[in-house]
Amino acid sequence: IRAEKAMVDGSWLDLAKRSKLEAQPFAHLTINATDIPSGSHKVSLSSWYHDRGWGKISNMTFSNGKLIVNQDGFYYLYANICFRHHETSGDLATEYLQLMVYVTKTSIKIPSSHTLMKGGSTKYWSGNSEFHFYSINVGGFFKLRSGEEISIEVSNPSLLDPDQDATYFGAFKVRDID
Amino acid sequence: IRAEKAMVDGSWLDLAKRSKLEAQPFAHLTINATDIPSGSHKVSLSSWYHDRGWGKISNMTFSNGKLIVNQDGFYYLYANICFRHHETSGDLATEYLQLMVYVTKTSIKIPSSHTLMKGGSTKYWSGNSEFHFYSINVGGFFKLRSGEEISIEVSNPSLLDPDQDATYFGAFKVRDID
Amino acid sequence: IRAEKAMVDGSWLDLAKRSKLEAQPFAHLTINATDIPSGSHKVSLSSWYHDRGWGKISNMTFSNGKLIVNQDGFYYLYANICFRHHETSGDLATEYLQLMVYVTKTSIKIPSSHTLMKGGSTKYWSGNSEFHFYSINVGGFFKLRSGEEISIEVSNPSLLDPDQDATYFGAFKVRDID
């Protein structure tokens, strides 16, 4: 019986460890600067790295610019978006800017898109200063179903900071749905 | 056999609970205001509380101003940095400020330092207002290996808000590495 | 013995799954716009949704405007607060604003209230621009005891953005206390 108990414990440790890893999807996606749209309008950002630098993904899928949930659960979602402008990057056409991020959830089964989180600021970036910078951070806890998609929309995409430590978003599963 | 099963279940509950706790390192470090560097340049903040007020640490080490990882895993890292200035503190050297935070990871084995997250804003803190305040929040999900060190760099350290609810950083382990 | 082992494994899977769910309280509360206080002073926000839209709660209690902890543990707490003003809403009483959030913990057993996190910014919202917006995000890892209460205080509540994606706060349990 002791041998059996050891076997039970052993198999359980393996099973518990394995199931725990399987049960915790995550992603951290960093901006792909080679493909940032221009313009000052609100756009969906579709180019992100998931497999280089700090970018990583497990038990979730990145496709067509969207982070796809493969496993029902409650997830903590976050985004950090940095905007910047240097006078050498061109003259600002307006000093009054609305620098915003929207984290959206799209359900394919019932075609609909909803904003989960938003953040940002109106800014006055005058031509008197040679450099301007502003970062937004949002985060929250949401119930996500398999097949649902998370995407990021921003205003003024041409002002995005292309560094991997500056513009990124991510998610990690915290717990199952009851 | 029933007694044995009860023993298996019992030992398992203890083991599961114990291993779960051991597997979840965390830290929440609050600024040590008695030792904030002066100046407006970018500096590494080395004085943090880990054992008073909201400061706490478990299965991680705080040494030489750095938060040291003791256990491989995926961690959620965060930082909240507040800057403030009151006219009674004297005039600012410049009204145009770059208030920034950088969360960096240093690997001792392969001596190298990388910025994981950055945030902040350029600000115009004019003399027309007697009080100025600004906070930055960043957060993200990162793979950390045992021995790696997390540290915080800021610009304009003399403007830091010394309250424990204002200037802090932290980490908690979410899951093991596969 | 094999049958017994299967039974052990089976009951354990149920027990583990059940205890895991029970061990992970959470809440995501979104602003109730029908009851936002007016004025520019600092107030406690007492009206939040916990059961509609993105609002949700499990193994925690929402009562009298406070999020009550039912289970000891270490929790990640977060808040996102958006302020906005459009010229059609009338003139601002002052162009110099202090837009702040304070996440506080109240202990009933030892009557006391403490600020866990704060964030915000002083802003100059001039009449030259027809629209102004600003968001704050804070987050941190805290030890909470059963019966303790979390609440949100803000300055300038009349400027709050009433959208559920804009103004919210939440918590989720990460681990037990040793």
């Epitope: 940032i36 600002l92 056409a93 307006t94 031509g127 | - | -």
Partner: antibody, heavy 122, light 108 residues
Framework: EVQLLESGGGLVQPGGSLRLSCAAS????????MSWVRQAPGKGLEWVSG????????YYADSVKGRFTISRDNSKNTLYLQMNSLRAEDTAVYYC???????????????WGQGTLVTVSS | EIVLTQSPGTLSLSPGERATLSCRAS???????LAWYQQKPGQAPRLLIY???SRATGIPDRFSGSGSGTDFTLTISRLEPEDFAVFYC?????????FGQGTKVEIK
């Protein structure tokens, strides 16, 4: 239809001053950045100066910095270029041009006015 | 500042032929922020292309732009009599905004 009409050009001696105007119509003038671009006789195009829609920020080519001042009167839908300390090399046709307003960075020029000739000579 | 060099200086072609104009930048043009203009004698320039490849309103589809980084091209697939003029490229990815010296497309 968007229309831009420049005026104020003419003959001026070196060291002299001139003020160019550009009357705009057919669009919400205050919402768009505007620029001046010049073209010396038989030469290419050179951007001279730009101004944001509000008039709060102004930009200049190094060749005219400190001598030229761009401004606008949004109530009159008019753009100005005050040119001081004029030199022979400032001789050119001066065009006013509208920014597209679709990017946060001042970008291409569309449309252009018909231009006004400035001749700096003794 | 970014220097734009256009080639050839002059292009002699007949109506119906294909014209290929080159614009080379001294450093990479950020975000494909490049425009093309056509200027006829005694007239103001007219916008043809922006964003390296987007046609302006009312521009015939025989005009097309391509390229990125430092090398950009304007192509006129079949020259019409009214197309003969001077063509300029302009970058707006960095300050100051600069123009190429122009390519003259003349009737052969």
């Amino acid at each position: 239809e968007v229309q831009l009409l420049e005026s104020g050009g003419g003959l001026v001696q070196p060291g002299g001053s001139l003020r160019l105007s550009c009357a705009a119509s057919g669009f919400t003038f205050s919402s768009y950045a505007m620029s001046w671009v010049r073209q010396a006789p038989g030469k290419g195009l050179e951007w001279v100066s730009g101004i944001t829609g509000s008039g709060g920020s102004t930009y200049y080519a190094d060749s005219v910095k400190g001598r030229f001042t761009i401004s606008r009167d949004n109530s009159k839908n008019t753009l100005y270029l005050q040119m001081n300390s004029l030199r022979a090399e400032d001789t050119a046709v001066y065009y006013c041009a509208k920014d597209p307003g679709t990017t946060v960075i001042m970008s291409w020029f569309d449309p252009w006015g018909q231009g006004t000739l400035v001749t700096v000579s003794s | 500042e970014i220097v734009l060099t256009q080639s050839p200086g002059t292009l002699s072609l007949s109506p119906g032929e294909r014209a290929t104009l080159s614009c080379r930048a001294s450093q990479s043009v950020r975000g494909r922020y490049l425009a093309w203009y056509q200027q006829k004698p005694g007239q103001a320039p007219r916008l043809l292309i922006y964003g390296a490849s987007s046609r302006a309103t009312g521009i015939p589809d025989r005009f097309s732009g391509s390229g990125s980084g430092t090398d950009f091209t304007l192509t006129i697939s079949r020259l019409e009599p009214e197309d003969f003029a001077v063509f300029y490229c302009q970058q707006y990815g960095s300050s100051p905004r600069t123009f190429g010296q122009g390519t003259k497309v003349e009737i052969k």
